[in-house]
C-alpha cells in the first residue's frame, strides 16, 4: 500500500517491517495482523474502538428470537482469527455469552457462566427509517442500489442479501449467510452490518475522504435512524422471553 | 452504444483558462462516476479528477488542484472541467472516463475506468 | 506515490504466455492497452479482472496482495503495444497510472 496504510481500516498501526519491507497493518487494541485488501472482524474493530476511548406490510415482523443490541459498547475478547470468543467478561468479572456478532444472548453471570459455543447470526434485519422526501423512492430502484452498496464497497457477495423491503419511511434489509454458505473469502454478514452501521452514522472505517452516497434515481437517501436486528441459528437464552428495543 | 464525446481543446494561451466538455449517451450517466484524464505528448497518461454521481464529492490530481473544477450536468448528461491558470505543461489529450464502482471505498482509483472518449487535444502555447 | 511500479518493457514470441506486473496501489487496478500516442487507449480489465466483452479471452487480470497482474496466454502480434496499468494511491486519495509497459511481439 501507498504509505503504508490500511484503506479498510483506519484503526490500525502499519509499518514496513515485516519480511522483505511488506507493509503490514495491525488492529489497534489487539495488535493483531488484519488483511486490508477487505473488511476487518467486527470484534477487533470494536476493541480498537474501545482502546481509542481509553485512550402489506411488506415490511418484515422480527422473530420473538430476535435480539437488538442494547447492551452497546463493550470491550470483547477475540480469537486468534478476530472472531468473539463465546464467553466476555467485563471488569468486574460479571459475564455473558455473545453469538458470532458479538451480541450478549443469554444473562449475565458470574465467572461460572459456561459459554460452549459460539452461536452463529445466520439472519440479520437492518432497519432504516429516512428522512421524508417530496415522492416515495421507487422499490425497484431502492433494491438495485442498495444491493449495489453491499456488493461494491463491502464486498458482500449478492447472494447473502436476501430481500430489500420498503414501506415509506422505512426500509428492511435482510442479511442472510448460514455457516454452510460462506466461503473462505466470503465477507461475513457481520461485519458487513457494522462497517453499513458505521457508514451511516458518518463514522465511516474505510481510510479514504469518500463517504456513504447513497441515492435512488438522483435522490439522495439520507437515514434518520436505525435499528439492526440479529437472528442466531439457536434462540437466545435469556430467562425472560422478550423481543428488546433499543 | 455507450459514448463518451470530448470537445473545447485547441490552442490556449498560458495563464488563461479553459472549458472542455464531455458529452454522454447510451448509459444511464446519473448512475456513474466520472474522470477526466490526460496524456502529454509522448508521456503516459496522468489522473485528473473525478466526481460522484450527484456531484456532491470531487477529487483532484496535485499538478491541477487549486486550478481546476470538475462538475456534471445529470439533466444534460455532461461532464466539464474548467481548467485556469493555464501552463505549458497542461498540453496534452484529455479524456473523459466512466467509473464502474461508485460505491467503492477506492472508487477514485483508475482501475474502475470501464469506457473512454476519443480526447480532444490541448495545446498551451504563446 | 508518483506512479504505479510497472516493467518498462517485457518482449515475447507469438504463442507465450506474458505477464506484466503493477505496484504500488492500495486499491483495484485496471490495464489500459495504447497502440499509438493520441489515440485513446482500450481498457482490456477493469477492476482487477473484469474483462470487457469486445476483448479476446487471452488477456486476463488478477491481483495477489498489493500486486497486480495482466496476462496474456498465447500473445499474437496485434497484442504489441503500450500497457498502463491504472489504480488508487492511498497516500493522496486518488487515482494514478504506472509509467507503461512496451509489450514487443518477437
Known amino acids: 500500500q501507498s504509505n503504508c496504510t490500511c484503506p479498510t481500516n483506519k484503526m490500525t498501526v502499519c509499518d514496513t517491517n515485516g519480511p522483505g519491507g511488506v507493509c503490514q497493518c495491525r488492529a489497534m487494541g489487539s495488535q493483531v495482523l488484519v488483511d486490508c485488501s477487505t473488511l476487518t472482524s467486527k470484534c477487533l474493530l470494536l476493541k480498537a474502538r474501545m482502546s481509542a476511548r481509553k485512550s402489506g406490510r411488506s415490511l418484515v415482523m422480527p422473530s420473538e428470537h430476535a435480539i437488538l443490541d442494547n447492551d452497546g459498547l463493550y470491550d470483547p475478547e477475540c480469537d486468534d482469527k478476530g472472531r468473539f470468543k463465546a464467553r466476555q467478561c467485563n471488569q468486574t468479572s460479571v459475564c455473558w455469552c455473545v453469538n458470532s456478532v458479538g451480541v450478549r444472548r443469554t444473562d449475565k453471570g458470574d465467572q461460572s457462566l459456561r459459554c460452549d459455543e459460539v452461536v452463529r447470526t445466520h439472519h440479520i434485519l437492518i432497519e432504516l427509517r429516512h428522512r421524508p422526501t417530496d415522492r416515495a423512492f421507487n422499490h425497484s430502484d431502492l433494491d438495485s442500489e442498495l444491493r449495489r452498496l453491499f456488493q461494491e464497497r463491502y464486498k458482500l457477495h449478492p447472494s447473502f442479501l436476501s430481500a430489500v423491503h420498503y414501506e415509506e419511511p422505512t426500509i428492511q434489509i435482510e442479511l442472510r449467510q448460514n455457516a454452510s454458505q460462506k466461503g473462505l473469502r466470503d465477507v461475513d454478514i457481520a461485519d458487513a452490518a457494522y462497517y453499513f452501521e458505521r457508514d451511516i452514522k458518518g463514522e465511516s472505517l474505510f481510510m479514504g475522504r469518500r463517504g456513504l452516497d447513497v441515492q435512488v434515481r438522483g435522490e439522495p437517501l439520507h437515514v434518520e435512524r436505525t435499528l439492526i436486528y440479529y437472528l442466531d441459528e439457536k434462540p437466545p437464552q435469556f430467562s425472560m422471553k422478550r423481543l428488546t428495543a433499543g | 452504444a455507450v459514448t463518451l464525446d470530448e470537445s473545447g481543446g485547441g490552442l490556449q494561451t498560458p495563464g488563461g483558462g479553459l472549458s472542455l466538455v464531455c458529452k454522454a449517451s447510451g448509459f444511464d450517466f446519473i448512475d456513474y462516476d466520472m474522470f477526466w484524464v490526460r496524456q502529454a505528448p509522448g508521456k503516459g497518461l496522468e489522473w485528473v479528477a473525478v466526481?460522484?454521481?450527484?456531484?456532491?464529492?470531487?477529487n483532484y490530481a496535485p499538478a491541477v488542484k487549486g486550478r481546476a473544477t470538475i462538475s456534471r450536468d445529470n439533466g444534460q448528461s455532461t461532464l466539464r472541467l474548467q481548467l485556469n491558470n493555464l501552463r505549458a505543461e497542461d498540453t496534452g489529450t484529455y479524456y473523459c472516463?466512466?467509473?464502474?464502482?461508485?460505491?467503492?471505498?477506492?472508487?477514485?482509483?483508475?482501475?474502475?475506468?470501464?469506457?473512454w472518449g476519443h480526447g480532444t487535444e490541448v495545446i498551451v502555447s504563446s | 506515490a508518483l506512479a504505479l511500479t510497472q516493467p518498462s518493457s517485457v518482449s515475447a514470441n507469438p504463442g507465450e504466455t506474458v505477464k506484466i506486473t503493477c505496484s504500488g496501489g492500495s486499491g483495484s487496478y485496471g490495464w489500459f492497452q495504447q497502440k499509438s500516442p493520441g489515440i485513446a487507449p482500450v481498457i482490456v480489465i477493469f477492476n482487477d479482472d473484469n474483462r470487457p466483452s469486445d476483448i479476446p479471452s487471452r488477456f486476463s487480470g488478477s491481483k495477489s496482495g498489493s500486486t497486480g497482474t495482466l496476462t496474456i496466454t498465447g500473445v499474437q502480434a496485434e497484442d504489441e503495444a503500450v500497457y498502463f496499468c491504472g489504480g488508487y494511491d492511498g497516500s493522496t486519495d486518488a487515482g494514478i497510472f504506472g509509467a507503461g509497459t512496451t509489450l514487443t511481439v518477437l
Open positions: 466526481i460522484n454521481r450527484s456531484g456532491s464529492y470531487t
Open positions: 472516463a466512466r467509473g464502474a464502482c461508485t460505491h467503492c471505498w477506492d472508487a477514485d482509483s483508475a482501475g474502475y475506468i470501464d469506457t
